[in-house]
Structures are given as structure tokens and as C-alpha cells.
Amino acid sequence: PKQTLPKPIIRAESTYMVPKEKQATLCCQGSYGAVEYQLHFEGSLFAVERPKPPERINGVKFHIPDMNSRKAGRYSCIYRVGELWSERSDLLDLVVTEMYDTPTLSVHPGPEVTSGEKVTFYCRLDTATSMFLLLKEGRSRDVQRSYGKVQAEFPMGPVTTAHRGSYRCFGSYNNYAWSFPSEPVKLLVTGDIENTSLAPTDPTFPDSWDTCLLTRETGLQKDLALWDHTAQNLLR
């Protein structure tokens, strides 16, 4: 079997939802010593980056300026050390937002409910679209989808304090082209009196935590590694 290097990790810096005409930045984290990284879009080569010096850098950033629907879709990356290529990374879905119009988000019975009540969000957009998306702020990877001609409903069932938070919705023209976001609707869920103080909101980790953790190996690190290797040999 053909030998390959371990697959790299692909990430979107700050967010995978990019407003049209803004810049997206994707990071491909591979290996120290990689001489070339390639970014692929929908199976075709999109861009190439050659880190300098390769032995000091474990990944690269790919910049996608002027975001539009032609650049929204599935991205992956690979890297090369010498003549040996890595496996392909997982796929990353890059979405363009702020296309066309702005939907309206409402919640029934209202934004303040008691734990155990059934809640339904309604997302309305008058322009032609059939797919709607509901996102909880800080949890933008957990996208709920619903379908409808001009309006879609998102039944939440009996809610708990974990449902507390701010919600936005989008109309979707295809999987990768979304409308402007709606104005946020803040859902406040109160628990039982004795539980309220013990039921904090679900911690919402901001999307900006999804950053590029690329590192540049310093000369000191290299010297320490070499010293350690020499010491190990002396001990043997």
C-alpha cells in the first residue's frame, strides 16, 4: 500500500460563516518540515502555500478574499514532506452570509418561559427560499434546519435552562449561501424556584475559540530537543 502522512487539521479562523465580500481565513495544520500545503475546494486545487522555513512551521493560513457564493462550499487540505503526501483532511463547510434579505425571528409563547414549557421559534423570509436555519449564539456548529415556503418553525419541545440564550435565524438559498442573520431573540428560561440558583445557563463557548493554533518552532526548542536527544544517547 502507498505510504501517506497523517491527515492535517483544517479550521476556519474565527468562523465558518463569512459575510459576502469579507475575507475568510482557513488554517491547515500539518507537520513541521512540510514543504507545501494545498487547499482544495469541491475537489479542485484552490491555493498553494510553501512555508518558510518549513522545519519551523507546523501549518499555514489560506486567505480567501472577497467571499461570494462561488467560493462557498467544501474545503479540504493536504501537505507534503519531501515527496510524500498526507492523507486529505476532513471536509470543512464554508458558508457565505449576508446574501439578499433579512429574515424575522419570533418565539411562541414568548421570550420568557418556564422550564418544561413547549417553545417554538418561527423564522420568516418573504423572498424565495425553502430552507431555514436556527443557530444559538456561541453554538453556531449546532445548526437546526427546517423547511417552508416563506416561514419555517422550529419546535424546541419542553425547554430546560440549557435552552437559555440568544438565537438567530437565516434563510438559505443553498447549503452554503445564507441570508443576512435575523435580529437576535433572547430566550429566558426560568427553572423551579429551588433549582433556579443551581441551574446556570449552558456555557456558550464563542466561535472565536475556533482559532488557528499554528506554532513556529524556535531555535531554543530545537536546541533543547537536540540536547535531549544527545543526553538520551549518552545514557544508553
Epitope: A47, V48, K52, K61, R70
Partner: nanobody, 126 residues
Amino acid sequence: EVQLVESGGGEVQPGGSLRLSCAASGRTFASAAMGWFRQAPGKEREFVAAISRSDDTYYADSVKGRFTISRDNAKNTVYLQMSSLRAEDTAVYYCAAVVPTYGSNIYVYSAAYNYWGQGTLVTVKP
């Protein structure tokens, strides 16, 4: 706004050489990644060569070793030196730019480019 104007096209015999130039207007040239694409009659536009803002280059397999892309930031110009030309190199050659860009990305995918020239025709025939 960036404007790109290609020149240098013409008719040449197989095995001959040509140098295409692409002059860019605007002060953003030094921060632009540049590329050359071509479109033969009845075919889709295809990637030929590209250069990053830091002079890293990438070539299509079909032109590797025969074509050279370079840039002169002082003249706001990118060049495509073409040698050992073949009949299959006959096409309209387009210059393109990605503005702005950061780092040293080399762009291969045509939709990555947001500015395009009008093209210059290269004909290779005996």
C-alpha cells in the same frame, strides 16, 4: 478598483517563444497575488501559472519547464515567458489578480481571482 491590461500576444511557429505582459493600475499591485489563465476555442478557461506576492510560483503540469511567470512590483507588471510553444498552447491568455491578499498564498482556482484582464490571443501554427 484594479485594471489589468495584457499585451504581447501574436502568432508564432511551434518551438518559438513569446513574452506576455500584464500591466496593473492602482497602488495595490504589491499586495496582489497574480495568475495567468487561458481559454482555447470551444474549451473551458484553464489555469496556466500563478505567483504570490512574495514571488512563490506554481505551474500547470502542461506548461511546467516551458513557461515562467515573474513580476516587477516597481512596474506594476506581471510577465509570462513562454518558450517551446506548441499548437495546443493556442488560446486567449488572461491575466488575473487576487486583491487584497496576505501571506504568500498562490491561487490556482479561477473563482479565487476577483480582477481579470480582457485577454490577449496567442496563436501557434507552422
